[in-house]
Amino acid sequence: SAPGEDEECGRVRDFVAKLANNTHQHVFDDLRGSVSLSWVGDSTGVILVLTTFHVPLVIMTFGQSKLYRSEDYGKNFKDITDLINNTFIRTEFGMAIGPENSGKVVLTAEVSGGSRGGRIFRSSDFAKNFVQTDLPFHPLTQMMYSPQNSDYLLALSTENGLWVSKNFGGKWEEIHKAVCLAKWGSDNTIFFTTYANGSCKADLGALELWRTSDLGKSFKTIGVKIYSFGLGGRFLFASVMADKDTTRRIHVSTDQGDTWSMAQLPSVGQEQFYSILAANDDMVFMHVDEPGDTGFGTIFTSDDRGIVYSKSLDRHLYTTTGGETDFTNVTSLRGVYITSVLSEDNSIQTMITFDQGGRWTHLRKPENSECDATAKNKNECSLHIHASYSISQKLNVPMAPLSEPNAVGIVIAHGSVGDAISVMVPDVYISDDGGYSWTKMLEGPHYYTILDSGGIIVAIEHSSRPINVIKFSTDEGQCWQTYTFTRDPIYFTGLASEPGARSMNISIWGFTESFLTSQWVSYTIDFKDILERNCEEKDYTIWLAHSTDPEDYEDGCILGYKEQFLRLRKSSVCQNGRDYVVTKQPSICLCSLEDFLCDFGYYRPENDSKCVEQPELKGHDLEFCLYGREEHLTTNGYRKIPGDKCQGGVNPVREVKDLKKKCTSNFLSPEKQNSKSN
């Protein structure tokens, strides 16, 4: 990482006494079963904990659950099981917490076999009180809140009915039958697929895609021959079966399904899949599976309409539909993504992009690390990051990579240093510049979390033995202090801190075991007295993101602009605080060819910034489908990268003409759509 401000580790003064005064133990009066924890609202301090325990009897399983509530970030808990009439709560539905700070919670109860419908418990006051409601259906899925209005809920029933409530679950109405999948879109719109003949599975590829914008009063069929659909950013995607064979193609809409365009992506066969890896309002990362059981595919990045795609990364590791991919959005720095590729020799290597998929490179070898046994050359190797795939393979990796938008530049991950990911026990590495440079932070696997917007990093060693020690760093992982939080070690099960990394509280969850019983226990540690003063201006330094060469005029330019951030100095031990807002200053860069992606019919040869015509399209008119009409494209091969803000400099010419012809290849052209009202 960037040269540290302090080579020597200064100890935080009197931290043991300060932390001891701020360590709160809570022993749960339960037998150990499963425990789930949810935060209710932002900065409210309200946590709900649901413990469940199954007792197998001779012919049935008897379940028991308890509900606890804290309103001080987990320091104290109150048993509120009586608020839900001591009912057994179904953990597979989890606790459905309302969006933003609505304070809404829905718990789905277990009901006896013969009942007419399910039962839910609803709270709209941050779980202070609950109302029991019997449902006219048995839910198949968790209640889904409309992102725009937390009073609007939707759920699918076990009979494939689509049910909607407009008054936060008080009253329910079945708005459609034979529904396979339903999702909220923007503006309280619901998208869903329906089957006509037998079932969702039988009709796969012959489903219809419907839309309602008025909670079921009226409907519009916006697609036919649908295999599946997905929403990402402002894009609606549908994979549609081809007329002639069993292949399917992606179609995309940016107007809620009124008009569709065929995405310039390869079609896929029965055994293959598409996957939206990431999407925002500018663009989408799409994975297209390779034919055969290869375990890899290709990442494509879209233009601003989601139609023209550029090949971004070959041999991208993605095991099966709904399987594992290591694709990770590094949220602490704009434009950065990390993923894994499966190389020809079947080893797995980590790749990183700093420009939203434009270029991928290996991760730079940490300065304080040696190349491991996987390296052919002991002086030349890279850092390889363990993510979802390693976790799924049961490697000794307790956590995926971690980054937080308000902890600018910080990325923490397990990794190994060599030519490929190693199955050996990994260490924990940190980057303070969004992935450009890395340092070994902790030896061996750990759980880790970020507090106070990066002001504190907390870690606990991953061990099969009981633990009683927590580690913390106030200088972005350079130096570590250890604190013994209990005399009696516990079997550790998880670290919990409020989402958003603004809190200064961390909860350590685990269980204690004695001769006959085991009990859940939590220790909540408040670090407020370690960071005893509020940060002042002198505690911050300015940092230019994406800086690789200070002498280069375009240093820091990514997607057409550079950003300078105020960041906490590593040597400052102070509180950013809950109200901390990232201070950044953008400045526009001149356009270069790097700010353009290759247009339809063009590609970039390796290590070249120029776009050249695809040989098979040379001399042909460039015609493609847009909104069900054929368009003629006049281009010199470039299209501005979505989200790129550059101005001046290079400016390639581009013109699109409407050929006033219908596309025969577009199955979702507007005249195939119809509307109806309830």
């Epitope: 960037a2 401000e5 080579e7 002198k538 330094t541 300015i542 230019l544 820091g556 550079k562 300078q564």
Partner: antibody, heavy 124, light 106 residues
């Protein structure tokens, strides 16, 4: 190689203001910090304040707070230092200097490029 | 603001001598210290940054050491071109300079 070229010598009356410019040529401007340092005749160096042009926010020494304004114009790669309410003890050579940078951080790596200096004389 | 005290204020030495200049900070500044050389009528020239890192192009006879509050600049073998005034400067927060040390011919 970067060069910092400062405006010419100034003679000012007490109570008036002076504005000294510092133009960068031959390298980047917006992503380096620029400091202003003065040196009275026969005296040592005194830091007045600094700015990172791309960031826009200036930082001033306590002694000059309220009397000095440091600005930067990225389009012309020029930094400015304006000192108001001049008095005779402000007679000095005023230097602009670029703060070195090895990484994205503006950690302190010393002032590696200096202007030639601008003599400001305050006399009635 | 942090005060920087440089000693001695004047130092007489001969060519070939080993010269040491000391700088003391009123509070810890970690390693945020730079050393400059200035000749009459000229702008200062950076010699050392971050207490001990030699700026490129500066002869290796110059070296810096120290951290916290005590720092030294050493010229291992004084050359005719080295007769000048030397300043230390801290940058932990706001920048302040030491009073200077004039190295003159004995």
């Amino acid at each position: 190689q970067v060069q910092l070229v400062q405006s010419g010598a100034e003679v000012k009356k007490p109570g008036s203001s002076v504005k000294v410019s510092c133009k960068a040529s031959g390298g980047t401007f917006s992503s380096y910090a620029i400091s202003w340092v003065r040196q009275a005749p026969g005296q040592g160096l005194e830091w007045m304040g600094g700015i990172i042009p791309g960031f826009g926010r200036a930082n001033y020494a306590q002694k000059f707070q309220g009397r000095v304004t440091i600005t930067a114009d990225e389009s012309t790669s020029t930094a400015y230092m304006e000192l108001s309410s001049l008095r005779s003890e402000d007679t000095a050579v005023y230097y602009c200097a670029r703060q070195g940078r090895k990484t994205g951080y503006y950690y302190y790596y010393g002032m590696d490029v200096w202007g030639q200096g601008t003599t400001v004389t305050v006399s009635s | 603001d942090i005060q920087m005290t440089q000693s001695p204020s004047t130092l007489s030495a001969s060519v070939g001598d080993r010269v040491t200049i000391t700088c003391r900070a009123s509070q810890s500044i970690s390693s945020w210290l730079a050393w400059y050389q200035q000749k009459p009528g000229k702008a200062p020239k950076l010699l050392i940054y971050k207490a001990s890192s030699l700026e490129s192009g500066v002869p290796s006879r110059f070296s810096g050491s120290g951290s916290g509050t005590e720092f030294t600049l050493t010229i291992s073998s004084l050359q005719p071109d080295d007769f000048a005034t030397y300043y230390c400067q801290q940058a932990d927060g706001h920048i302040t300079f030491g009073g200077g040390t004039k190295v003159e011919i004995k």
